[in-house]
């Protein structure tokens, strides 16, 4: 059974992941540039199911495409450093899902824009945090 300290650590990591994703989404929403239109043309795979920490495998597999899209947004008005940001998220995701479990991600048939993708994973984090609070 999970100890209170491990639950607390999980909650903190989820809160950090949530903040990271919210920061990215806020940056994109604030981005007034033709580049934004181009960013929205990129398609992301969405998980068929995302209710457990093991489903973060689906997020991990989309981090490289996410970094590539964010690289488009580099300007003095977009205050994200994609490599640092994605690296930070990757560390959190690996710790949360556990590196020893092998889970094959199942994706939904429909792809999504970066905004829909981020909102989906933000909702995932919020949902799990709510069960831990």
């Amino acid at each position: 059974a999970p100890t209170s300290s491990s639950t607390k650590k999980t909650q903190l990591q989820l809160e950090h992941l949530l903040l990271d994703l919210q920061m990215i989404l806020n940056g994109i929403n604030n981005y007034k540039n033709p580049k934004l239109t181009r960013m929205l043309t990129f398609k992301f795979y969405m998980p068929k199911k995302a209710t457990e920490l093991k489903h973060l495998q689906c997020l991990e597999e989309e981090l490289k495409p996410l970094e590539e899209v964010l690289n488009l947004a580099q300007s003095k008005n977009f205050h994200l450093r994609p490599r640092d940001l994605i690296s930070n998220i990757n560390v959190i995701v690996l710790e949360l899902k556990g590196s020893e479990t092998t889970f094959m991600c199942e994706y939904a048939d429909e792809t999504a824009t970066i905004v829909e993708f981020l909102n989906r994973w933000i909702t995932f984090c919020q949902s799990i945090i709510s069960t831990l609070t």
Epitope: M23, L25, H79, D84, L85, N88, S130
Partner: antibody
């Protein structure tokens, strides 16, 4: 638990910049994402933005984008908030807060010619 | 941006009174709502997080309820040290936004 201590009050001329510091102690600095919130005299609370202290990246409220810069120095466990092109409406108390349960004491910035 | 609307903007009450402050979000924020108390010249103090969870060290006379768009902060029996301004805040999405505040004054 982390404690936050902010720099002292500042008086600035319109058009100038101000840099407010927030020093964290008592816990692992990189575990605490830092928000900045300001409060004009007699007014409510206004979120300015957030910095991830580990990676150093930031996200700002649209109202402040282009005028605000948040940075951190991991060697001194300090985060900074710099606001440029100051105007009288920027006269406010500026707070740093981590996790919303720990706040700095506030820094009064007065913009006056 | 999500707008947070508090009511009333001010109220007068006596020690021992039951006080209720409401907060309405312009869209559903689930339970991603916090309540703060602020006294003049001081930083805000977190009272309630996740709509109904009491922060450590906060007296049990404070309670929060609600989900979705409508939330309530209740002080079951007002004490002299409770006269202050109270703010609600959503952290469901960025930008984080606050209510305009409710000032609780002595009748």
């Amino acid at each position: 638990q982390v404690q936050l201590v902010q720099s002292g009050a500042e008086v600035k001329k319109p058009g100038a910049s101000v840099k407010v510091s927030c020093k964290a102690s008592g816990d692992t600095f990189t575990d605490y994402y830092m928000h900045w919130v300001r409060q004009a005299p007699g007014q409510g609370l206004e979120w300015m933005g957030i910095i991830n202290p580990r990676a150093g990246y930031t996200s700002y409220a649209l109202k402040f984008q282009g005028r605000v810069t948040m940075t951190r120095d991991t060697s001194t466990s300090t985060v900074y908030m710099e606001l440029s092109s100051l105007r009288s409406e920027d006269t406010a108390v500026y707070y740093c807060t981590s996790g919303w349960d720990v706040w700095g004491q506030g820094t009064l910035v007065t913009v006056s010619s | 941006d999500i707008q947070m609307t508090q009511s009333p903007s001010s109220l007068s009450a006596s020690v021992g009174d039951r006080v209720t402050i409401t907060c309405r979000a312009s869209q559903s924020i689930s339970t991603w709502l916090a309540w703060y108390q602020q006294k003049p010249g001081k930083a805000p103090k977190l009272l309630i997080y996740a709509a109904s969870s009491l922060d450590s060290g906060v007296p049990s006379r404070f309670s929060g309820s609600g989900s979705g768009t409508d939330f309530t902060l209740t002080i079951s029996s007002l004490q002299p040290e409770d006269f202050a301004t109270y703010y609600c805040q959503q952290s469901y999405s960025f930008p984080v936004t606050f209510g305009q505040g409710t000032k609780v004054e002595i009748k």
